[in-house]
Structures are given as C-alpha cells and as structure tokens.
C-alpha cells in the first residue's frame, strides 16, 4: 500500500506534461492576491527642513490579481531532465477588495531625487542634478497617485536629465506585459528529490550581486517542493523579488480545509546581522549605512536594482534593529500580520497556502550639493510600501486534493 | 577630482588592429555611459563608439563609419573601458579620447594610421 | 544623421565685444539633448553648456545659450583674452551622437 503511493505520489509530482504537478505548474489554480499599504508621509516639509523622524501612516490595503498568467516558453530537455520557461507578470486591480481607488494620493519620497545624487556622487554631477531638481521645481518629497508609484509616472527632473534616460519611475516600473525569468528547473524525471529545483536563473547559475555564497540561487520557487517533506527539512527558496535565496524553517501543523499541512515559516535569523548570524555576512555589502554590519532586519538591493539606493524589509520594520527604525514614526510591527509562511502539503511537497510579506523602503541621505537634501542630518531607510501576497487552495480544488492525495494515504 | 588616462595609441599599418584603454577614477565609474571620440584636422571632433551599464546589458552604439571593425567594452571593477580597433585604414588617424561626455575629458592617445 | 553645422567657422572679436556664434541641426531635436563644449590650443574639450542654456561648473556668467528646435546659439556678453578657443555643440538626441565643426573664435 505505502509502496504504491509513493510510486504514484513520485509519478504525480513529475513536472512534464500529463501529471497533476505539471498542469497545476503551468497555471497555479490559486487565486493569489497581492495586497498593498502605502506608506503616507504626514510631516514632508518638517522632514526636508529640519531632518524630523519621519512620521507616516499606513494606507491600504489595495489589492491586485496576480499571477494569473501561464508560463511561458515551456521547454522540456530530456538530456539533464529540465524543464525552462519565464513567468509572465500582470496585475489586475480589485476596487471591491480595496480601500479606495487606483487614483488615490499618497505623499511619499521623490524616488529620482533620492535616488540620483547615491548613483552620481560627483560633485559637479550633484550641481547639474541640483540645478534640474530646481528648475523641475522637485523636492524631497512628492504627492502620487498609486496607480503612479507602483507602475510608473514620467519624473518631471529625469525629463530634464541631459542625456537620453529612461525617465519612467515607478515602484514596480516596468511590470505589466514584462516576464520574470528564463528559469530552468529539474523537472524530478530522474531524481524526484530534485524535482522544482532551480538549475539556473536568466541562464547563470548565480545571481551576480552577492559575494561569496550569499549569490548561490538554492531551492525551488516556493510554490513546491520535493516531495516527503519532513519536520526538520529546511526549505530553501529563491525570490527574484528580494534578489536572493532565502530558507524557512518548520513551524507548526496546520489544518488547512480538512488537509494536514506543515507551516514554514522565515525566521528571524535569516535577517539578522553577522554579529548574530555569521552565515550573512556575505549578505552586508556596505559599512556605513548598516554601522559596520550591525544592523539587521534590512537588505540593500541596489546592485540588483541598477544601483538605485532600494532595501528590502518585512512590513514596520518586524525583526529590524532599532537605529534602522528609530527615525520612522508610526510603525506597529506585528509577527502575525508581518511575517511569510508558506504551508506545505507534506506528502506532495505543495505550498497550498501562503502569505509573502515584504517592505520597499528607499535610502535617501544628505546631499550638501543638492538643496532639496542639503538640511538632512541623518540618513533615512524610507519605508514606501509593504506587500502582502496571497494564496490559498480553492475549496473544489482541497475537495480534489483530499480524494487524490490525503484520503488514499488515510 | 574625477580623472581619465587613456593609452595604447601608437603607430601602425593599414589593415593593422590596435586596443586603446582608458582608466577613470574620482567618480563612480560604473554608473556612467562611456564614450571615445577622436578627433583629426581634417573631420574635427567625432565620436566613435558608446557603452551603456551593467544594468543595460552594457548596450553599445557605434559611429556608421567604425561599426564591425571596432568594439568598445568596460570592466567596472577595474574602472576602464576599451576601445579594439581591427582592420585600421588611414582615416581613423586621430587624437583619441575616453569620456563619459558630460565629465571630464582625458588628454586622449594619437593614434597612427600609415604604412 | 543629424548634422550640426555651425556658424562661422572662425571669427574674431575685441576684449568687451559681444559675440553670438550658431549651431544648426539638420533635424529638430530637444533643447535638453544639446551641449557645447570649450577646446583651447592643445588641449582637450571642456563640457561648457549643457542642456542648451546650463552653464556648467566653472564658466563665468558672461556665457549664455539659447535655442530650441533646430537652431542653437551661444553668446558671451562681453569677450576676455581667456575665451579664445573652438567651440562646438554636440547633441545626445539620436546616434550616432554629433558634433559641430567648431567655431574658433580668436581675441584681436
């Protein structure tokens, strides 16, 4: 009995066409929403005068459809037993499951004008850039609608940049009618403890912004794993939105619709500095803004983001060291609401449910030759947004489950 | 103070090749476009090739009359770019600079075309 | 392409004097894509106006430019000793880039 399910469980997860993993694979049947709150800053002109904490208050949630495409460019090779393809992004607004409208303001920091005087630190560059900011009558801060901050607004001083730049900033610019990948994985024909491990990413087998191992791209893309997953596995996974691979650990056993499922979840440990966590060390790539590799809870990005000055946190700042969020008032960090789990199916290695949860914040410091940055004492990680991206097996679906899967193994 | 050496220039035969380098410092080499431009009595100022950053994919342009006989490359770590010249004719003979145009310029390398 | 011709080729003024010198583009292009530069004897070009009206760090006051669409000029509103020198535009509008064949202007 147990040999047969586990020979049709070792058939079944098979990424190739005719499983049940593989048409599951193509087109996730989840319906995964992905929810936004907006970081609105309530004292901007205190702030770029006087280098105030910064005070804000979140707006949201705003929600979106998200990965409702199919894979694409799905290419089988028989020879090392992978399968390739690139995910296509999209984002489909949800007025009914939002707050508000696409074209609500939100008063937040200038992207450009924080961004531009960390990549052009020349002092004659910082007086050209001076002198655009001004003339495009751009400050420290600016009001945007959220249809405008997440997918982009033509930025009044990029326009005036004298040679010919892209001039589109947007949080998440571009996005829509964009793919993420190529990504090659080990479809488990072989070697079904490989299966839905990352061979490579954009063809490299490291991702090319990290020292040392901190680069490697481990595990699968979260949405399964190798099948028999136990208790003390931990479950390592890339994600090309933090520019890293990333571990969860076992948390707790979930009943999830009359299924049994394991909760991992990301803990704390993975975000800690080196001090308390020599493995990341090689994730600290800059002394000054981290106090000599202190700071936690924060993740610079910017060599994955073109240099632009973006860290990446959990939402309010949850596991972050003090001095990151001592300059921002109005965070309430909450390890339920702020944290990522993912509750895999055991048997399968499924992620039936999950709930990403991250923070784009953007580094903004003195600027003696830029005037809208001239008056600040301190530099600030602001936080812009936070995320939380969802997705839970359908009713039908967890029925079907059942049948197939957990009511034979009973 | 952002600086610019360029070297490599020299003498050489029609059809020859030669490679130019250019070494930046005092600026974040990495986040700028770079440029060679040349410039000779008879055509004045003319640029020849351009490369973009990493995060462009290092996207190159080039000047109609250069394309296929030339290939500018960088390597940001060592804060140089390159100029490879092939199949060299009597015309490319210049001064040849290293810019990322809107800094500094370097005090170029001549470059010899004739047999 | 888009040829830049610039206008006159060499000219000479008095210490004091105000001089305009030209640039015409073969094609219209934006007033932010088009730069001068400054080339005195023996050396190498120096960015001088950028974006058609900014004067870059370092240029006395007395520069000034102007222009849109396809005609650009650049002025000094009263020539010093230090000013002779070729000056050419250049546009960053499309590639390949241009230059101008440079106005030299000499100081009697």
């Known amino acids: 009995g147990d040999m047969l399910i586990e020979k049709t469980i070792k058939r079944e997860v098979v990424l190739e066409e005719g499983t049940t993993a593989f048409k599951n694979w193509v087109k996730t049947g989840t319906t995964v929403y992905r929810q936004f709150w907006i970081f609105d800053v309530q004292n901007p002109d205190d702030v770029a005068k006087n280098s105030s904490k910064i005070k804000v208050k979140q707006r949201g949630p705003y929600t979106y459809r998200v990965r409702y495409l199919a894979k694409e460019n799905i290419t089988q090779d028989p020879e090392d037993h992978t399968v390739s393809f690139v995910q296509p992004n999209g984002a489909i607004f949800e007025p009914s499951l939002s707050v508000g409208t696409e074209d609500d303001n939100f008063t937040v920091l200038n992207l450009a004008v924080a961004a531009a005087p960390h990549i052009y630190q020349n002092s004659f560059v910082q007086v050209v850039l001076n002198s655009l900011i001004k003339k495009s009558k751009s400050s420290m801060f600016q009001t945007r609608s959220l249809k405008e901050l997440l997918w982009g607004y033509k930025d009044p001083f990029l326009s005036l940049v004298p040679y010919p730049i892209s001039t589109t900033v947007g949080v998440f610019y571009p996005y829509n009618d964009t793919v993420d990948g190529v990504y090659k994985v080990f479809n488990g024909k072989d070697n079904i403890s490989k299966v839905a491990i990352i061979e490579s990413y954009k063809g490299k087998r490291n991702l090319s912004y990290w020292p040392s191992y901190c680069d490697m791209i481990n595990g699968t893309d979260a949405a399964s794993f190798p099948p028999f997953v136990e208790k003390s596995r931990t479950l390592r996974f890339f994600s090309s939105d933090i520019c890293r691979s990333i571990y969860a650990v076992f948390g707790s056993e979930i009943d999830l619709k009359g299924i049994p499922v394991y909760r991992f979840v990301l803990p704390a440990n993975a975000f800690a500095s080196p001090l308390q966590n020599p493995d990341n060390h090689c994730f600290c790539t800059e002394k000054v803004i981290s106090n000599n590799c202190t700071s936690y809870g924060v993740l610079d990005i910017g060599k994955c983001k073109e240099g632009k000055p973006v860290y990446i946190s959990l939402p309010h700042f949850l596991h972050a060291s003090p001095d990151v969020s001592e300059p921002i008032e109005g965070l309430h960090p909450n390890e339920d609401e702020h944290r990522t789990y993912l509750d895999v199916e055991p048997i399968t290695g499924f992620t039936l449910q999950f709930a990403k949860r991250l923070q784009v914040n953007i580094l903004v410091k003195p600027a003696r030759k830029i005037e809208a940055l001239k008056n600040l004492k301190r530099p600030y990680i602001v936080p812009i947004l936070w995320l939380n991206e969802t997705g839970t097996i359908g009713d039908e679906k967890a029925e079907m489950f059942k049948t197939q899967v957990t009511g034979k193994i009973k | 103070e952002e600086k610019l050496e360029e070297s490599g220039g020299g003498l050489v035969q029609p059809g020859g090749s030669m490679k130019l380098s250019c070494v930046a410092s005092?600026?974040?080499?990495?986040?700028?476009?770079m440029n060679w431009v040349r410039q000779s009595p008879e055509k004045g100022l003319e640029w020849v090739a351009e490369i973009r950053l990493k995060s462009n994919n290092y996207a190159t342009h080039y000047a109609e009359s250069v394309k296929g006989r030339f290939t500018i490359s960088r390597d940001d770590s060592k804060s140089s770019v390159y100029l490879q010249m092939n199949n060299l004719r009597a015309e490319d003979t210049g001064i040849y600079y290293c810019?990322?145009?809107?800094?500094?310029w370097g005090q170029g390398t001549t470059l010899t075309v004739s047999s | 392409e888009n040829v830049l011709t610039q206008s006159p080729a060499i000219m000479s003024a008095s210490p004091g004097e105000k001089v305009t010198m030209t640039c015409r583009a073969s094609?219209?292009?934006?007033?932010?894509?088009l730069h001068w530069y400054q080339q005195k004897s023996g050396a190498s070009p120096k960015l001088w106006i950028y974006?058609?009206?900014n004067l870059a760090s370092g240029v006395p006051a007395r520069f000034s430019g102007s222009g849109s669409g396809t005609s650009y000029s650049l002025t000094i509103s009263s020539v010093e000793a230090e000013d002779a020198a070729t000056y050419y535009c250049?546009?960053?509008?499309?590639?390949?880039?241009?230059f101008g064949s440079g106005t030299k202007l000499e100081i009697k």
């Open positions: 974006s058609t009206s």
């Open positions: 810019t990322p145009l809107l800094l500094r």
């Open positions: 005092g600026f974040t080499f990495s986040n700028y476009w």
């Open positions: 250049q546009q960053y509008s499309g590639y390949p880039l241009t």
């Open positions: 094609s219209s292009l934006s007033s932010t894509y």
